[in-house]
Interface confidence: low
């Protein structure tokens, strides 16, 4: 028994004077508590706590129950214990069925034993199954069996605690371990939609999605820059043992432009947090803004090709799109797509393809597109570049040589006469009259061109050549002269 | 899973018609142009038709220009190939194929049915 | 219409060896070359898009490389898994492919 010095306060001292009593099942208990401060006994086994206000605790017939701790406390709190193991052949363990382990720690299977002296107290795996090879265990009679650093591979693991008496195996019930995942990363969010854009009056609703390996991580939706609660609904699921799911949705019934702005889904567990955004932007109405990708002025050379391409973003989505060109909508030879498949993506892209363009083809084409709220329209003025075509060189009757030419940009005229037969007419011919026919007409066509020179300069044989030229070609029409004595005979145009 | 699934092949005889169809899952088809690809045996892969998402624009292999015709249906999630006036030459596996791009106007396909297998034989 | 020539049309190599596919175009395509490999009784798959861009999952012993008219597919490590056809396509307008090239075992 415990001594102290005199006038410090004692523990009580118990009779029988040991730490530990075994008595068989049927026997007498007698415990005596010696203390002048005495206050009262206490029992422990498992969850299980009685007290007893007498100093001397009789159990008349033991029972395996009965076994336990027993501490005797007197008035300044100081306590001595006696541990009684009731011997019951018919039941070998106490237990308590419940069993919990934290992943990396220490979890205790409770099975105390009745009698210390059966031996090799031990876990075996149920239905003969071997325990994990990494499984360790520390046995304690009184308490029961600790497993060291539990696994998560443990989970669901069904155990008995075991003994041997006389020469054979006893098992105690079952025991399922349910194994309480550590938190060994943040949780994982994420969002349908990174990005919203809403009309007034529309629904907001956006769901976040938390992923972690039990239900105890935490998740809000947070309004950045406002502490104002949000609105959420909850849904969980369980997939499978340490893969937990929490959606989180987020509504407003009815937004307002007001709302716009950023939301943040934030998780939290033991381990760090983890967060994701979306943005919110609230538009009093759809638009439709278009971006030419080429400029909108195009020249093309005769017989090219040319692709008029836009870009537009649009909101809602685009309903009717369409190239018109002198009134006529194009059925073919045009192709409309979305930039991104992504589903918030509203820029969209439309090429028209313009193949083998003639001279006659050029004009105002325009791209058209509308959505339910709103039209808009871009227009491309194409030019068809021509190589100069000589319509019409003619002797006129008043003497003048005429030619007139038609091409795009705008010809330019020059005469030159070649003496004799000489193939290269270098000397050249100022004209007397140079006029633009058509400049009044439609803006986009072949322009025309006249010029005159006057045939009675010219005293000796020959040929004149009028060149009709600008930047994309030269054409040349040739006038030949013949005089027979004083008289000029003829005049042959020809090419 | 992302997964076409074309049918409507078989034996027809030259100057027959045949409608194949193409059955798309697990992606938003609506927003995707579609095509029909063909491996004739000793000619290797050729690409013959395609489509628009909205259905609007079509393009074909000048071969097949007014015999075939490539249509969608986006509420049902198919893509279609109507061949009429069918030639010998046009003998070959079928795919349907989804068209994905990179930048604007700039296409691949990334993604092709098992085929259907079209043999036009007298 | 813009044709695409492949060479050689077929060649026999080893496990283990290195292996270089070349497609040139009639005009210029930019970058706007895909490969594809094809396998007999099934459907083609997509290796390599914008002339070098490898697609998800494709192993990395697949590389593409070239310009405007020539381009090149590089098979680093040829694997048993490797033997195949593999076409070019030009991605710009009317998706002409190349005549194939067959990669058998020596």
């Known amino acids: 028994q415990p001594s102290v010095s005199p006038g410090e306060p004692s523990p009580p001292s118990i009779h029988p004077g040991k730490s530990d009593l075994i008595v068989r099942v049927g026997d007498e208990i007698r415990l005596l508590c010696t203390d002048p401060g005495f206050v009262k006994w206490t029992f422990e086994i498992l969850d299980e706590t009685n007290e007893n206000k007498q100093n001397e605790w009789i159990t008349e017939k033991a029972e395996a129950t009965n076994t336990g701790k027993y501490t005797c406390t007197n008035k300044h709190g100081l306590s001595n214990s006696i541990y009684v193991f009731v011997r019951d052949p018919a039941k070998l363990f106490l237990v308590d069925r419940s069993l919990y382990g934290k992943e990396d720690n220490d979890t205790l299977v409770r099975c105390p034993l009745t009698d210390p002296e059966v031996t090799n107290y031990s876990l075996k795996g149920c239905q003969g199954k071997p325990l994990p090879k990494d499984l360790r265990f520390i046995p304690d009679p009184k308490a029961g069996i600790m497993i060291k650093s539990v696994k998560r591979a443990y989970h669901r693991l069904c155990l008995h605690c075991s003994v041997d008496q006389e020469g054979k195996s006893v098992l105690s019930e079952k025991f399922i371990l349910k194994v309480r995942p550590a938190f060994k990363a943040v949780p994982v969010v994420s969002v349908s939609k990174a990005s919203y854009l809403l009309r007034e009056g529309e629904e907001f609703t956006v769901t976040c999605t938390i992923k972690d390996v039990s239900s105890s991580v935490y998740s809000t939706w947070k309004r950045e820059n406002s502490q104002t609660k949000l609105q959420e609904k909850y849904n969980s699921w369980h997939h499978g043992d340490f893969n937990y799911e929490r959606q989180a949705t987020l509504t407003i019934s009815s937004a307002r432009v007001n709302d716009s702005g950023v939301f943040m889904c934030y998780a939290n567990n033991t381990f760090g947090s983890a967060n994701v955004t979306t943005t919110l932007e609230v538009v009093d109405k759809g638009f439709i803004n278009i971006f030419p990708m080429i400029n909108t002025t195009v020249f093309v050379n005769d017989g090219e090709n040319v692709d008029l391409i836009v870009e537009y973003e649009a909101f809602p989505k685009p309903e009717h799109q369409q190239w018109i060109y002198m009134n006529r909508t194009f059925t073919d030879k045009w192709e409309d797509y979305p930039k991104s498949e992504n589903e918030s993506n509203i820029r969209y892209v439309s090429e028209l393809h313009l193949t083998r363009l003639k001279g006659t083809e050029g004009g105002t084409y325009t791209f058209l597109v509308s959505n339910s709220d709103v039209n808009a329209a871009i227009a491309f003025n194409v030019y068809v570049n021509t190589k100069p075509e000589i319509l019409t060189y003619d002797r006129l009757v008043n003497g003048m040589l005429q030619c007139v030419a038609a091409g795009f940009p705008e010809p330019t005229i020059d005469w030159y006469f070649c003496p004799g037969t000489e193939q290269r007419c270098s000397a050249s011919v100022l004209p007397v009259d140079v006029q633009t026919l058509n400049s009044s007409g439609p803006p986009f066509g072949k322009l025309v061109v006249q010029s005159s020179i006057d045939s009675s300069a010219f005293k000796h044989n020959g040929t004149v050549e009028c060149k009709a030229y600008n930047d994309v070609g030269k054409t040349s029409a040739y006038f030949n002269f013949a005089f027979k004595g004083n008289n000029k005979e003829q005049i042959h145009p020809h090419t | 899973e992302v997964q076409l699934v074309e049918s409507g092949g078989g034996l027809v005889q030259p100057g027959g018609s045949l409608r194949l169809s193409c059955a798309a899952s697990g992606f938003a088809f609506s927003g995707y142009y579609m095509a029909w690809v063909r491996d004739a045996p000793g000619k290797g892969l050729e690409w013959v038709a395609n489509i628009n998402y909205p259905g609007s624009s079509t393009y074909y292999l000048d071969s097949v220009k007014g015999r075939f015709t490539i249509s969608r249906d986006n509420a049902k999630n198919s893509l279609y190939l109507q061949m009429n006036s069918l030639r010998a030459e046009d003998t070959a596996v079928y795919y349907c194929?989804?068209?994905?791009?990179?930048?604007?106007?700039?296409?691949?396909?990334?993604?092709w049915g098992q085929g259907t297998t079209v043999t036009v034989s007298s | 219409d813009i044709q695409m020539t492949q060479s050689p049309s077929s060649l026999s190599a080893s496990v283990g060896d290195r292996v270089t596919i070349t497609c040139r175009a009639s005009q210029s395509i930019s970058s706007y070359l895909n490969w594809y490999q094809k396998k007999p009784g099934k459907a083609p798959k997509l290796l390599i898009y914008?002339?070098?861009r490898l697609q998800s999952g494709v192993p990395s012993r697949f590389s593409g490389s070239g310009s405007g008219t020539d381009f090149t597919l590089t098979i680093s490590s040829l694997q048993p898994e490797d033997f195949a056809t593999y076409y070019c396509q030009q991605g710009r307008r009317l998706w002409s492919f190349g005549g194939g090239t067959k990669v058998e075992i020596k």
């Open positions: 914008y002339t070098s």
């Open positions: 194929a989804r068209g994905d791009y990179y930048g604007t106007t700039y296409w691949y396909f990334d993604v």
